[in-house]
Interface confidence: low
Amino acid sequence: ACDTATCVTHRLAGLLSRSGGVVKNNFVPTNVGSKAF
């Protein structure tokens, strides 16, 4: 399962779809990320 800050935030915000954790708005942090990054 996705365990990064981004995923946690999106899970809490109800943004994760039910189809395997893909973010509905296709957002990924960049850090490095980086969300990052």
Epitope: T4, A5, T6, G20, V22, V23, N26, N31, G33, A36
Partner: antibody, heavy 122, light 107 residues
Framework: EVQLVESGGGLVQPGGSLRLSCAAS????????ISWVRQAPGKGLEWVAE??????????HYAEAVKGRFTISRDNAKNSLYLQMNSLRAEDTAVYYC?????????????WGQGTLVTVSS | EIVLTQSPATLSLSPGERATLSCKAS??????VSWYQQKPGQAPRLLIY???NRYLGIPARFSGSGSGTDFTLTISSLEPEDFAVYYC?????????FGQGTKLEIK
Amino acid sequence: EVQLVESGGGLVQPGGSLRLSCAASGFTFSNYWISWVRQAPGKGLEWVAEIRSESDASATHYAEAVKGRFTISRDNAKNSLYLQMNSLRAEDTAVYYCTGYFDYGLAIQNYWGQGTLVTVSS
Amino acid sequence: EIVLTQSPATLSLSPGERATLSCKASKRVTTYVSWYQQKPGQAPRLLIYGASNRYLGIPARFSGSGSGTDFTLTISSLEPEDFAVYYCSQSYNYPYTFGQGTKLEIK
């Protein structure tokens, strides 16, 4: 104008310490997740540490290679990020970049500093 | 940790040609992949996030695709300023990781 400016790099002996700073301006620093990413001379990028935004309790995460030696912190009142580096090793020699990210719903913002060089050598 | 493998290591092309860069993850990362461009002496620059979203101000000739473990960065028609090193990264699991980079050089 948005800026991230790193400072504090330099030459240090193995086993020594350094404190890197990253000064932010031109955006709401406290909303941003910030990471340190490093790049050894002639090598690729390596994530070092992350600190979440103020609203995410400024939680931290570290790469295994630096866990227990490096500490990331932030001072939102000063719009500043820090990386305290202890027990430095030759393999920590790199340019260290700070990079900030913010998701405002429809898109994201991502900023990088120019980097500061850390050289660990006797 | 999730290992990202980029190929080819070096890509030699001419301006106007199409460039296709690959990034393969050792485990499924859904769409938590970003692409960066880096020129000598400069910080990385975000091109693509979420596998396929162009970052602000990035020209339309840059596009990203893929999900799961296989990802691609495509530059439809190379401009002289596109010759640089390109890195993919994942932020699906800690630690965040980067690929080793693909150097895009002028043929």
